[in-house]
């Protein structure tokens, strides 16, 4: 399927609001960083066809657009660049859903890897039991944003591969 | 698990409009859609529209167009429907239903509806 | 834009026998996409299969669904005294999101 043409740059433009949504330096908050054990291995790219692929990219946008759209992360960011941030992720959710409804046209094939998907979930399940223990603190916030633009720089390299295999 | 409470039933006359509201609780999202399905009596479903409550992203079917409003506040997460220029025809229970954010993967999810409310009946009537 | 046809439109049977349950689509809907759901009188619908084949928390594994393509089947392997409702198959298109449901299918005890 083609990801239109605007993907990278929606991607990008999001990385780019995440990081000016930063509200404290992140070396005041190194006694709280925390290695949430991204599952880099689902998002190398070799082993996927495109639609589990996208799956496995989809999963990872709307887990995110989940922790963003929360109440707790309503006071934690600025209301104005949350909204475009999370509109971003829901502009990508759409493009991915619609490349794997054209996949889907094209021939029926596995929508996902079962277990890459759990450890996507299970992932975003160590990020918000890390933000309920240290109870939505600034610098929980801080640290899960640090951690996202590192997943999502990670998922931007995924997407950039599916397009050159296009 | 997510709870869907909607409003009671209503009296509508022709012409007039109807808002019939839906609440969720549980473990809600405002990240998934919140949709509207109506049905007459001894008739079957219908897809009206949905809302993305976090970003307040409406869609409409072609049918209802012009005459349907899908709003919805955040916190206590609720869905309302407004329908406007009501017609006999319009009388049916109206459900509103929302996918699970439990479902893998989540590109599933927004593609079924996993919660229904109880239904709300409007008779229009002159 | 997709219609869903079920048939029959009622099916009379003994608790005990099998049911199948047809919904052809107009034009082609990938398997991911197809739902299917069941209501009982004056309840609201209850989602049983999604994806095509998987089954719904909750539901008996005597519910199954199958196909592809444009033809797509509930099958229910021993009818059960609570099985006997309305069934509906439902799909999902996108760009921009369409949910579209077929008339539905009774199955009455005979």
């Known amino acids: 399927c083609d990801l239109p043409e605007t993907h990278s740059l929606d991607n990008r433009r999001t990385l780019m609001l995440l990081a000016q949504m930063s509200r404290i330096s992140p070396s005041s908050c190194l006694m709280d960083r925390h290695d949430f054990g991204f599952p880099q291995e689902e998002f190398d790219g070799n082993q996927f066809q495109k639609a589990p692929a996208i799956s496995v990219l989809h999963e990872l946008i709307q887990q995110i657009f989940n922790l963003f759209t929360t109440k707790d992360s309503s006071a934690a960011w600025d209301e104005d660049l949350l909204d475009k941030f999370c509109t971003e992720l829901y502009q990508q959710l759409n493009d991915l859903e619609a490349c794997v409804m054209q996949e889907e046209r094209v021939g029926e094939t596995p929508l996902m890897n079962a277990d890459s998907i759990l450890a996507v979930k299970k992932y975003f399940r160590r990020i918000t039991l890390y933000l309920t223990e240290k109870k939505y603190s600034p610098c929980a916030w801080e640290v899960v944003r640090a951690e996202i633009m590192r997943s999502l720089s990670l998922s931007t390299n995924l997407q950039e591969r599916l397009r050159r295999k296009e | 698990e997510v709870q869907l409470l909607e409003s009671g039933a209503e009296v509508k006359r022709p012409g007039s409009s109807v808002r019939v509201s839906c609440r969720a609780s549980g473990d809600t999202f405002s990240s998934y859609p919140i949709s509207w399905v109506r049905q007459a009596p001894g008739q079957g479903l219908e897809w009206m529209g949905r809302i993305l409550p976090a970003l307040g992203v409406t869609n409409y079917a072609q049918n209802f167009r012009g005459r349907i409003t899908i709003t919805a506040d955040k916190s206590p997460l609720t869905a309302y429907l407004e329908l406007s220029s009501l017609r006999f025809e319009d009388t049916a229970v109206y459900y509103c239903a929302s996918p699970s954010a439990d479902i893998i993967p989540s590109i599933l999810g927004t593609t079924l509806f996993a919660f229904w409310g109880q239904g709300s009946l409007v008779t229009v009537s002159s | 834009e997709i219609v869903l046809t079920q048939s029959p439109g009622t099916l009379s049977l003994s608790p005990g026998e099998g049911a199948t349950l047809s919904c052809r689509a107009s034009q082609n809907v990938s398997r991911h996409y197809l739902t299917w759901y069941q209501q009982k009188p004056g309840q609201s619908p209850r989602l049983l299969i999604y994806g095509g084949s998987s089954r719904a928390t909750g539901v008996p594994d005597r519910f199954s669904g199958g196909g592809s393509g444009t033809d797509f089947t509930l099958t229910i392997s021993r009818l059960e005294p609570e099985d006997f409702a309305v069934f509906y198959c439902?799909?999902?298109?996108?760009?921009?999101?369409?949910?579209?449901f077929g008339q539905g299918t009774k199955v009455e005890i005979k």
């Open positions: 439902q799909s999902y298109h996108s760009p921009p999101p369409v949910y579209t």
